[in-house]
Structure formats: C-alpha cells, structure tokens
Interface confidence: medium
C-alpha cells in the first residue's frame, strides 16, 4: 500500500532502520550518534544555502522478539517487519537508511514498491547490484571483483610481468559479513571473476589451505582470503610456504596498516593486503574515537548517508523540485558529494567508489608499504612502489602457475 511520506512543507524526515541484525556488531547508540552528527552538519549546510527547512531522523527499532540472532542470518524478515511497522504508523520519511545486511536489503527491495531512495551501509552481495533506488556506501563485492580481475590481467609493471589466470579462494564459512559476500562473489560460477579466470578452486578446510602451501602439484600459486592478519595466522601459523606462493588478504575496512607503530610480523611476508585508503580526519573525530577500524567505516557510512540525503535535498529544493517523486528516488547515483571526511563519489548504480590499496611487507623495514592503488571509479591501477623490497625472487611477483614461462 502507498505510504504517505513525511517529506514536504519545509519538513523533511529520514527513516533510519535500527535493526538488531546488522552487518557489524555496532551498538545502535553509536549509529544514532553518527546519524545525529550528520543531521547537525546537514542543517548547517542547508542554512548556509539560505534554505530554512527542518530535517529530522526517526529511528525505527525492531522489537527483537523473533529476529534476535544479532547477525545477518535472520535479517530477511526483520527488514520487512520494520517496513510493515512504518506502513502501519504512516511514518515513512523521504529516504530510508539501513538495512545493512544483504539478505534484508534484497528482500525489502524485492517486496516493496520503492518510490523512495534506500541508503545502505553494507549490502555487500552481488544480489544487491544494479538496484535503481539503492545506494551503497561501503564497497560492494562487485568493486572487489573488478579490482582482482584488473590486477590478475596486469603484466606491464616492473613488479608484475605475468598476467595471471588462476587462483585458489579460501572460504570456510566463519567469515565476517563483508568477507562472506566478497568470497561468495568470487565463488559464484556466473560472476565476472569466475568468467575471467581459467582455473579457480575454493578451499573450505584448514587442511586444504595448509596442504597447498607446499604442494608441488598445486594448480595456482595465488590464494585469496578475507579477514585480518590474526585470521591468517590461525590458519597458517609459522608453517613453511613455497617461495612462489602469493596470498592476497582482503581486509578492506582495517586502517591499522597505516599506523606508525605497526610492524608486519614475519608470517605476512608472502602476503599482499588489499585494504581501503584511510580517511584523513577519522582517527581523532568525536564519533569514531572509540570504534575499531571496521566500526569506524560502518558508522561513517551511516553519517555519510545523512550527508548524501542533505546534498540531494539541497539540489532539489534549490531547483524547486518535488522530493516525493520517482525522480528524487532515482537521483542518488552518478554524483560526488561532500562526505564527512572529504568527497564521496557514487557510480552510475549508486555504489560508492573508493581507492583500494595493495600493501606488501618490506623485507628491509618490516613495515607495510603501498605497492599500488586502484581507483574503482575508473577501473585503473596506479603503481606506487616501482622497486618493492619483496620476499619474492628478483623483487617481482611470481607467475601464477609454477614453471610456466613469460606470458
């Protein structure tokens, strides 16, 4: 049924879904703080533009009686229940912020007549790609996939002279929500990554992973996994690793690697870490001071969701356009807005673009160093360290298949 939106006559409301099941175990209080900080900034920006309007957020809490696992596995119905609650109360805002779980976002998008924009901090899975009124403010799996294919094909860098076409993917089912969907995308036989690779096998057991490290008959030298360094250590420990093995550790939302006092442990020498370029001011900002790196990105996405709404509201009001129209609902894409920590770019499908950074461990300094960066907006790789002090022979990344000559 058509729900009237509290979204006119100088009063504009944001509906924020505060779901018990969330992509990250962030206390809802922290998310409220992030939203409230965003509201303060938006009000200031609108006032500066001479727009005398009211912007508020309504936090919609789930009762938590049925969907109480705390993670994304029971989020599907919780999202729909919250929408029903909104519908019954006739309390829909101009925009919906949340949910963060892929399951709930997919189902809500499927089961509702969306005449309003949805902004998500999460919804990483491929099933949430290409949704006309959905905006995602944390890097979705599609972006990771495009980087990996781009990097695999690259063969004209001083430190990577072979294009790769093979990979193992380690996926044991205990991953965090972001990793779960990133690895799902790599595993899916119909995905771009699978389509572009000649050989790909998913390793599901610790022993499979451990055996590959020294197996002379392995079909690829490259293993992709997702998580923090401690996740890798639990798996690999201090085991010997063949000299031409390359482990790609996807750890996007972890900016510790860039901190001054961080030294890379010895077991990271065969590892390239893929992470996101850290924000400028976040480490000391008031809303994020006590959050771990992952949580900082999650809370920041909520805050940026508010700023994105403020940006669109300002544009539509300045142009004298109606907010409760399909045009507004479809407008949250193909743009750059001023986020909390600098400009934020959304692609044609409303997904955030970012700079991914590939790090290696310097054998000289034992520090993480930037090998290259990748701009997801233009799908382009930019080498940074032309003479890396790698552990690999000749300071070059090995071929992905042992014994194969130059490609």
């Amino acid at each position: 049924s058509q729900v009237s939106q509290n979204c006119h006559n100088g009063s504009y409301e944001i509906s924020v879904l505060m779901m018990g099941n969330s992509a990250f175990a962030e206390p809802l209080k922290n998310l409220e703080d992030a939203v409230n900080e965003g509201l303060e900034i938006v009000r200031g920006r609108l006032q500066n533009a001479g727009l005398n309007v009211t912007v508020n957020a309504t936090f919609m809490y789930s009762d938590g009686l049925i969907h109480n696992s705390g993670d994304c596995r029971s989020s599907t119905c919780e999202g729909l229940d919250l929408l029903r609650k909104i519908s019954n109360a006739q309390r829909m805002g101009c925009v919906l912020i949340g949910p963060s779980c892929t399951y709930s976002t997919f189902q809500m998008y499927l089961d509702t007549e969306l005449s309003y924009p949805m902004i998500s901090a999460g919804s990483f899975g491929l099933s949430c790609d290409y949704k006309e009124t959905l905006t995602r403010l944390m890097s979705p799996a599609r972006k990771l996939m495009y980087f990996l294919v781009n990097f695999w094909k690259t063969n004209d860098l001083p430190f990577k002279t072979y294009s790769w076409s093979t990979s193992y993917v380690y996926k044991n089912g205990t991953e965090t929500e972001d990793c779960f969907w990133y690895l799902n995308a790599l595993e899916a036989s119909v995905s771009y990554f699978s389509h572009e690779l000649g050989f790909k096998v998913v390793l599901r057991q610790d022993k499979e992973f451990q055996d590959i490290l020294m197996d002379h008959n392995r079909k690829s030298n490259v293993i992709i996994m997702c998580g923090g360094p401690e996740f890798l250590y639990k798996l690999k420990g201090d085991r010997a690793v063949a000299e031409d093995i390359v482990i790609i550790l996807v750890d996007l939302f972890n900016d510790q690697y860039f901190e001054d006092n961080v030294t890379a442990p010895d077991y990271m020498k065969n590892v390239l870490v893929l992470t996101l370029s850290p924000g400028n001011s976040l480490l000391n900002s008031s809303f994020s001071r006590n959050l771990s790196p992952t949580k900082r990105d999650f809370a920041l996405a909520y805050l940026n969701g508010i700023l994105l709404f403020g940006h669109m509201l300002k544009i539509f009001l300045e142009n004298g356009e109606n907010i409760t129209t399909p045009k507004f609902a479809h407008a949250f894409r193909n743009l750059t807005f001023e986020g909390y920590d600098g400009p934020v770019t959304l692609d044609d499908w409303g997904d955030v673009d970012s700079t991914m950074v590939l790090l290696y461990t310097s054998v000289d300094t034992k520090k993480y160093k930037v090998l290259l960066t990748y701009d997801t907006h233009v799908n382009k790789t930019y080498p940074v360290d032309m003479s890396p002090t790698f552990t690999w022979k000749n300071s070059k990344l090995p071929n992905d298949i042992t014994g194969r000559g130059p490609q």
Epitope: S22, A23, F24, A25, E26, P27, G70, D71, C72, T174, E175, T176, E177, F180, G227, G228, P229, E230, F231, Y233, K234, G237, D251, N254, D255, Q256, Y257, E259, N261, V262, T263, A264, P265, Y267, N290, L291, S292, P293, T294, K295
Partner: nanobody, 127 residues
Framework: QMQLVESGGGSVQSGGSLRLSCATN????????MAWFRQAPGKARERVAA???????RYADSVKGRFTISRDNAAKTFALQMNSLKPEDTGTYYC?????????????????????WGQGTQVTVSS
C-alpha cells in the same frame, strides 16, 4: 580455552614506573584483539589500552603518552609499560583477549567484547 596470567603489579610512588605482563598459552598474533582494563575500588572497569589484530594500538585519554601496550610473539606475552604513574592509576589491572572477529565483527572496546580474562594484578600508586 585461552589462559591468561598477569604479573608485574605492585606499589610505587607517584611518578614511578611499572611493567605489567600477561602470559598466554597461544601466540599473540593469533588473537583478534587484546586489552588491559583496570578497576578502581567502587568504580566500573575501564579499558586502558588495546592492541588490535594488525598491531594498531588504542589508549584511554587519561593514559595517552604515559602507557605503552606491546606484544611479544615468541614469548607469548602482552605487556603494558606504565610510566609517570599517578595515584588515580591505582586499581586492579586485568588483561583480556578476544580470539576472533566472529561472524559480524567486534569493536574491542567494552568488557562484553572480550571472552577471556586474567585474574588481575594490583597496582597501587601513592603520593
């Protein structure tokens, strides 16, 4: 189950130093995060310092610049070096660890984020 044993507590004059140590039965690199908490008489337990999975460190505002958290993988220990101690640093110090991120992450900020705790070691700073 991970075992944690603290040592190094004691009595010291204001301005003095102590080094607390936390011995584990697992290598520190395999731990998602580790923290030192303290509890003063009649007060809630507070997180003083934490070391995260990649080696990033976090400190309470009240100890920044005075305390340093570190880990020694070979010796299977975490340490808290406490310099320029003040009477308000008095309390029981506990080390706590969390083994992994779990299915949906962990902030490593509150007591609830940590599953393994030591017995505690007493620190007394007199003026």
């Amino acid at each position: 189950q991970m075992q944690l044993v603290e040592s190094g507590g004691g009595s010291v004059q204001s301005g003095g130093s102590l080094r607390l140590s936390c011995a584990t039965n697992e290598p520190p690199y395999s731990i998602y995060c580790m923290a030192w908490f303290r509890q003063a008489p009649g007060k809630a337990r507070e997180r003083v310092a934490a070391i995260l999975n990649a080696g990033g460190t976090r400190y309470a505002d009240s100890v920044k610049g005075r305390f340093t958290i570190s880990r020694d993988n070979a010796a299977k220990t975490f340490a808290l070096q406490m310099n320029s101690l003040k009477p308000e640093d008095t309390g029981t110090y506990y080390c706590a660890t969390r083994a992994d991120a779990g299915r949906w992450g962990s902030a490593c900020t509150t007591e609830l984020d940590f599953g393994n705790w030591g017995q505690g070691t007493q620190v007394t700073v007199s003026s």
